[in-house]
Interface confidence: low
């Protein structure tokens, strides 16, 4: 008799999830000498232990603590780049500017980037059919809780000047409900972080507006200032040129505004 299975509103676990996590771990530890000590099988076991046999709407940060411990990593705290709704450009940037790091440049972020996963209560099965959607089903699902946990820790670790890349093409350039707006902003440590510098990325080629004056940016500035952290904002009018100038800062065209 086929066992009844909970139907969730979100997509199911990514195909070949265990193999993908393990392969990513091996690749990451090969590329990053400082993480060569990491035992990838133990990492997978800890990852699996966080959600297997647990109700996928009842996951806690505590469930991920063994994984967090194994994935402990030292990133220069003054070289952190946060992002919101503009992941691809943020990642392109850190691929060029190798001394800056997004969360996905760390082991744990790299392992889980773009993946979905969940289990089922009281069975050791991974659910490849469906997983809870954050809005339609529940917020305490395995994926959301994972990103909330690692994002909080990443933000807590930051110091000096922290940069955040924001998408100027969206109606809410700063969204209080994003991971950045709901988790990272509130976990920057004022005793360590001097300034949050926002880079607002423009979408349209002819867009010359000062998006740093956008009401949502003013809202971000207000939240940050109340936390005793300075705020600064820059318009990146030409993201393509911006990346080009990061690659080749000596280029004569890079002295003008990007």
């Amino acid at each position: 008799v086929p066992r009844w299975r909970q139907q969730w509103s979100g997509p199911g676990t990514t195909k070949r999830f265990p193999e993908t996590v393990l392969a990513r771990c091996v690749k990451y530890t090969e590329i990053h000498p400082e993480m060569r000590h990491v035992d990838c099988q133990s990492v997978w076991d800890a990852f699996k232990g966080a959600f297997i046999s647990k109700h996928p709407c009842n996951i806690t940060e505590e469930d991920y603590q063994p994984l967090m411990k194994l994935g402990t990593q030292t990133v220069p705290c003054n070289k952190i780049l946060l992002w919101s709704r503009i992941k691809d450009l943020a990642h392109q940037f850190t691929q060029v500017q190798r001394d800056m790091f997004t969360l996905e440049d760390t082991l744990l972020g790299y392992l889980a980037d773009d993946l979905t996963w969940c289990g089922e209560f009281n069975t050791s099965k991974i659910n490849y059919q469906s997983c809870p959607d954050w809005r339609k089903d529940c917020s305490n699902n395995p994926v959301s809780v994972f990103w909330k946990t690692v994002s909080r820790r990443f933000a807590e670790a930051a110091c000096d000047v922290v940069h955040v890349m924001l998408n100027g093409s969206r109606s809410k350039i700063f969204d209080k409900n994003s991971t950045f707006g709901s988790v990272e902003v509130h976990n920057l440590q004022p005793e360590k972080v001097q300034t949050l510098e926002a880079w607002v990325i423009h979408g349209g080629r002819e867009d010359s507006r000062d998006l740093c004056q956008d009401p949502t940016i003013k809202e971000l500035e207000s939240i940050i200032s109340k936390r005793n952290i300075q705020f600064s904002c820059k318009n990146i009018y030409r993201p393509d040129k911006f990346l080009q100038c990061v690659k080749n800062p000596e280029d004569s065209s890079c002295t003008s505004e990007i």
Epitope: T74, C77, R98, D160
Partner: antibody, heavy 117, light 113 residues
Framework: EVQLVESGGGLVQPGGSLRLSCAAS????????MHWVRQAPGKGLEWVAY????????YYADTVKGRFTISRDNSKNTLYLQMNSLRAEDTAVYYC??????????WGQGTLVTVSS | DIVMTQSPSSLAVSLGERVTITCKSS????????????LAWFQQKPGQSPKLLIY???TRESGVPDRFSGSGSGTDFTLTISSLQAEDVAVYYC?????????FGQGTKVEIK
């Protein structure tokens, strides 16, 4: 055995230039960041500059920013410090040091730079 | 910039006695992600270059005698020499390496009474 040998120190007039070298051996030079640290006569240690293994990361102390340039040639296992616009307060023994877990585990014997007219 | 304050600036201790040097940082050196303190201790004997004794606040560098130990977390750190030997006469420096610019304490001179 790790060895770091500095050279290039000497007497120079204020406003002058000097290039220090640090020859490294006994470890895979290109895999490690390197620091310059200085010590004025009878004073404490002052960190000067850092360069990553593949020169991708470079940092300077505010006191030398814009005047000193750190560089390295991994094919020659050599670290450099180009010092321009030298001032009397730059007089010190300059040490190169190998990076280790972000701090410094091996130091050279130092080379003395004297800035005086 | 972050200031590292060492105390005392000098001390004279009898052979075999315990030596305690403290180092205070104006900013926490504890990195929450890995729970490590970014603090090192160096020894500089007269006429010699500095030598790494302790890193991560309490990890002894290989080859360093076990009479040397480091402790502390956050902003307050201690270097202890459990039983002073003649060869321990030196200046001791703490150093923060949490982020750049790196900063050293002003040094503590240890002599024999």
């Amino acid at each position: 055995e790790v060895q770091l040998v500095e050279s290039g120190g000497g007497l120079v007039q204020p406003g002058g230039s000097l290039r220090l070298s640090c020859a490294a051996s006994g470890f895979t030079f290109s895999s490690f960041g390197m620091h310059w640290v200085r010590q004025a006569p009878g004073k404490g240690l002052e960190w000067v500059a850092y360069i990553g293994g593949d020169s991708n990361i470079i940092y300077y102390a505010d006191t030398v920013k814009g005047r000193f340039t750190i560089s390295r040639d991994n094919s020659k296992n050599t670290l450099y410090l180009q010092m321009n616009s030298l001032r009397a307060e730059d007089t010190a023994v300059y040490y190169c040091a190998k990076s280790h877990d972000y701090t410094m585990d091996y130091w050279g014997q130092g080379t003395l730079v004297t800035v005086s007219s | 910039d972050i200031v590292m304050t060492q105390s005392p600036s000098s001390l004279a201790v009898s052979l075999g006695e315990r030596v305690t040097i403290t180092c205070k940082s104006s900013q926490s050196l504890l990195y929450s992600t890995n729970q490590k303190n970014y603090l090192a201790w160096f020894q500089q004997k007269p006429g010699q270059s500095p030598k790494l004794l302790i890193y991560w606040a309490s990890t002894r560098e290989s080859g360093v005698p076990d009479r040397f130990s480091g402790s502390g977390s956050g902003t307050d750190f201690t270097l202890t020499i459990s039983s002073l030997q003649a060869e321990d006469v030196a200046v001791y420096y703490c150093q923060r390496y949490y982020n750049y610019p790196y900063t050293f304490g002003q040094g503590t001179k240890v002599e024999i009474k």
